[in-house]
């Protein structure tokens, strides 16, 4: 397993709809065809996984159907869309990244995307 | 080094508008976010709201909601606070924050704003 | 909105004591976005904690936080001449993000 730089920006605000979009750049040493990105998200110590995708050089990622995230690729980069989000989901967002193939196997993990999220202000009731 | 440099004291009358800016060095400047927060004469803190530079998405304090416009210019570095409407309770030092994953810093070195008739 | 109480108003030490403040939010913050500034006449506030315990770059050991849930503690261990000064605690894991009213250590 050999190291691969990683990079992301520090802090998103996500959308007043809930949707946070950011780009993972990782430094390629090779020519790579098959690369899976995962998102892990850290809160409280926590780390778990948001979503992931493998997805050959110049394919769309593709993940799961009930997936959170949406995703293009363009050369060495990853723009990564996660939706559905709420106040509780702020956290920091980890761009994991593995160039699966050909070997060797690449690994490189960013150093996180604080995204905060602000559940939108209710309505004030109005009186027809 | 990372630094944040604001512009100078104003006075205005009420019911004027003025613009603070902050111009940030040192450091990759669509990465991070920029608060302001304010301080009365003699006053604690006050969160006036942020921006993410990243993508332009802002977050207000409701208080000033519709009287407050935070903007940035990354083509220099720059952050703008704008505030309406003036009042004599507006007067106070402005402040701009790097905001970080889970921080503030640096701040700025602030801008004094009097408002007065 | 999250309300910050700090304890006591003013603290009035000699160099050499321990300072202990108090930091009570009206319901519980994340302790990772909770962070301590100090700020000294004239001056802006400069950054001391974050995290609720993370000391941040270039701040002496003898500043420490702790707490979790709704408490939360800053401890000076030794009070050094340049330590007096006014103390504010932030919340910013939920907006508004908010800061406490601050607490000021005189010189005794």
């Known amino acids: 397993c050999k190291a691969m730089h990683v990079a992301q920006p520090a802090v998103v605000l996500a959308s007043s709809r809930g949707i946070a979009s950011f780009v993972c750049e990782y430094a390629s040493p090779g020519k790579a065809t098959e690369v899976r990105v995962t998102v892990l998200r850290q809160a409280d110590s926590q780390v778990t996984e948001v979503c992931a995708a493998t997805y050959m050089m110049g394919n769309e990622l593709t993940f799961l159907d009930d997936s959170i995230c949406t995703g293009t690729s363009s050369g060495n980069q990853v723009n990564l869309t996660i939706q559905g989000l709420r106040a509780m989901d702020t956290g920091l967002y980890i761009c994991k990244v593995e160039l699966m193939y050909p070997p060797p196997y690449y690994l490189g993990i960013g150093n996180g995307t604080q995204i905060y999220v602000i559940d939108p202000e209710p309505c004030p009731d109005s009186d027809f | 080094q990372v630094q944040l440099v604001q512009s100078g004291a104003e006075v205005k009358k009420p019911g004027a508008s003025v613009k603070v800016s902050c111009k940030a060095s040192g450091y990759t400047f669509t990465s991070y976010g920029i608060s302001w927060v304010r301080q009365a004469p003699g006053q604690g803190l006050e969160w006036m709201g942020w921006i993410s530079v990243y993508n332009g998405n802002t977050n207000y304090a409701q208080k000033l909601q519709g009287r407050v416009t935070m903007t940035t210019d990354t083509s220099t570095s720059t952050a703008y606070m704008e505030l309406r409407s003036l009042r004599s309770d507006d007067t106070a030092v402005y402040y701009c924050a790097r905001v970080g994953a889970n921080w503030f810093d640096p701040w700025g070195q602030g801008s004094l704003v009097t408002v007065s008739s | 909105e999250i309300v910050l109480t700090q304890s006591p108003g003013t603290l009035s030490l000699s160099p050499g004591e321990r300072a202990t403040l108090s930091c009570r939010a009206s319901?519980?913050?994340?302790?990772?976005?909770l962070a301590w500034y100090q700020q000294k006449p004239g001056q802006a506030p400069r950054l001391l904690i974050y995290g609720a315990s993370s000391r941040a770059t270039g701040i002496p050991d003898r500043f420490s936080g702790s707490g979790s849930g709704t408490d939360f503690t800053l401890t000076i261990s030794r009070l050094e001449p340049e330590d007096f000064a006014v103390y504010y605690c932030?919340?910013?894991?939920?907006?508004?993000?908010?800061f406490g009213q601050g607490t000021k250590v005189e010189i005794k």
């Open positions: 932030q919340q910013y894991g939920s907006s508004p993000w908010t």
């Open positions: 319901q519980s913050v994340s302790s990772s976005y």
